[in-house]
């Protein structure tokens, strides 16, 4: 005997009161596959989410998390609270970044400095809580009369002061 | 499926008290810190109380000593027993999976109403 379940499309559900009929999903449900015998219940963004997609009697809806919060986990399971930029979340809440270390987002830890001069390089502004260091030309390269443009000077004479 | 459903919401005056319930199914409760936030439109989302697998508790300053939250792990249930209330108590309650930082809310929650 066939199973005229499997020709019950997504958005429907095989109804088996009713001799195997497809029977639209009802309000507030959806199947997203073919030959289902039960439709899900649909997802309600409530509390500390938003609906970000309606549901459909083929989809699930997708929720957001409101202001102040973000996303976490498959499909937006949780949400986190914002930090400020400058700060990261401790178990204690959200705390400024220690000196050495940013945080340029609401999310996330706060990440060390960029160190310059392991890439030999010299420090073009400082960093703050927010941003990052900003690494210059090394501190060769800012030397008088120095361009990158040109290949370096030969070595100096004992005695001879540079210009 | 995840599924919270809260009830005991309800109008009262300022000083009484009330017994929210949460029921949960779809995932292993004992394993979970559950808890309590309230929202009033227009107003931030507000973490209320917590209770971790252990049993060990929080509260926002807000309801410290008014408020106190317990768990039954045998009916998967948590609860928020509410005392000394106040106008501003007045808000939508929602139970919580997850901690003070980061937690869901999967249910329709339930109306709390403090007025004389």
């Known amino acids: 005997l066939q199973d005229l379940c499997s020709n019950c499309p997504a958005g429907t559900f095989c109804d088996n009161n009713r001799s195997q009929i497809c029977s639209p999903c009802p309000p507030n449900s959806f199947s997203s596959a073919g030959g289902q015998r039960t439709c899900d219940i649909c997802r309600q963004c409530k509390g500390v989410f938003k609906t970000r997609k309606e549901c459909s009697s083929t989809s699930n809806a997708e929720c957001d998390c409101i202001s102040g919060y973000h996303c976490l986990g498959a499909e937006c399971s949780m949400c986190e609270q914002d930090c400020k930029q400058g700060q990261e979340l401790t178990k204690k809440g959200c705390k400024d970044c220690c000196f050495g270390t940013f945080n340029d987002q609401k999310r996330g830890i706060c990440r060390p400095w960029t160190n310059c001069s392991l890439d030999g390089k010299s420090v073009l502004v400082n960093g703050t809580k927010e941003r990052d260091v900003v690494c210059g030309p090394s501190p060769a390269d800012l030397s008088p009369g120095a361009s990158s443009a040109t290949p370096p000077a030969p070595a100096r004479e004992p005695g001879h002061s540079p210009q | 499926q995840v599924q919270l459903v809260e009830s005991g919401g309800g109008l009262v005056q300022p000083g009484g008290s009330l017994r929210l319930s949460c029921v949960a199914s779809g995932f292993v409760f004992s394993t979970v810190t559950m808890g309590w936030g309230r929202q009033v439109p227009g107003k931030e989302f507000e973490w209320v109380s917590g209770?971790?697998?252990?049993?060990?508790?929080d509260y926002a300053d807000s309801v410290k000593g008014r408020f106190t939250i317990s768990r039954d792990n045998a009916k998967n249930t948590v609860y928020l027993e509410m005392n000394s209330l106040k106008s501003e108590d007045t808000a939508e309650y929602y139970c919580l999976i997850g901690g003070r930082w980061s937690f869901g809310t999967w249910g329709q929650g339930t109306q709390v109403t403090v007025s004389s």
């Open positions: 209770v971790s697998s252990e049993g060990i508790t």
